[in-house]
């Protein structure tokens, strides 16, 4: 028995930040679980981890250079990524493992979300067009 995961097919990070919501076919209330977000087709880079425990606050962990936070819903975990770079445009996969109560569960691999990071373009403000020729 596997947990199904739904993700948006594509998100655009205009301001170098994005909310990626992982929706599960499973209620996470009062469960001990590990939800993670992985970058790349091979999922080789673990971007962010959210630990849920029925008795403690949510713990969020990231050590791969990503600025990450997490929020828990009844059947979802939302990863909030900030300070993204254009070269971090990639496909991102949600993953989850539920430890307690038994039985142990994990997810079917999702289709992933392509996060397209748009670079910040510095444009001259129309209020201050710069020096004009005399």
């Amino acid at each position: 028995n596997k947990i199904l995961v739904k993700q948006s097919p594509m998100l655009v990070a205009y301001d170098n930040a994005v909310n990626l919501s992982c929706k599960y076919s499973y209620n996470l209330f009062s469960r001990e679980f590990r939800a993670s977000l992985h970058k790349g087709l091979d999922s080789a880079v673990e971007v962010c981890v959210v630990y849920g425990n029925y008795s403690q606050q949510l713990q969020v962990y990231s050590k791969t250079g990503f600025n990450c936070d997490g929020k828990l819903g009844n059947e979802s975990v939302t990863f909030y990524l900030q300070n993204l770079y254009v070269n971090q445009t990639d496909i991102y996969f949600c993953k989850i493992e539920v430890m307690y109560p038994p039985p142990y569960l994990d997810n079917e691999k999702s289709n992933g979300t392509i996060i397209h990071v748009k670079g910040k373009h510095l444009c001259p403000s129309p209020l201050f067009p710069g020096p004009s020729k005399p």
Epitope: R34, E46, Q59
Partner: nanobody, 124 residues
Framework: EVQLVESGGGLVQAGGSLRLSCKAA????????MGWFRQAPGKEREFVAS????????YYEEAVKGRFTISRDNTKNTVYLQMDSLRPEDTAVYYC?????????????????WGQGTQVTVSS
Amino acid sequence: EVQLVESGGGLVQAGGSLRLSCKAAGRTFSSYAMGWFRQAPGKEREFVASIEWDGGGAYYEEAVKGRFTISRDNTKNTVYLQMDSLRPEDTAVYYCAASRWRTALTNYYDVADWGQGTQVTVSS
């Protein structure tokens, strides 16, 4: 609880190779992710590599990618770390770790049990 016994550490010259082994006894070995951490003198223990319960996926610290390879043999309850192109900065005590999870082991929160560690020294 699982008992973990490491072997294969030693002194090697820069550019050389070592193969670490970690034999597990106790808990069902094949049901959990396994991995390696290391601790250099005066530094925190850091993640090196891990492998999923069925060997289906592996994770590596950026600094060791392309040089280190983790593998496991569930019939022998053993996990291996093949270390090639060793550098002086790889000098550390290497610890085997058993995860609480089937597919995940990348940080302290994931570790259920530690081995005693084996010293790896790379001379220049």
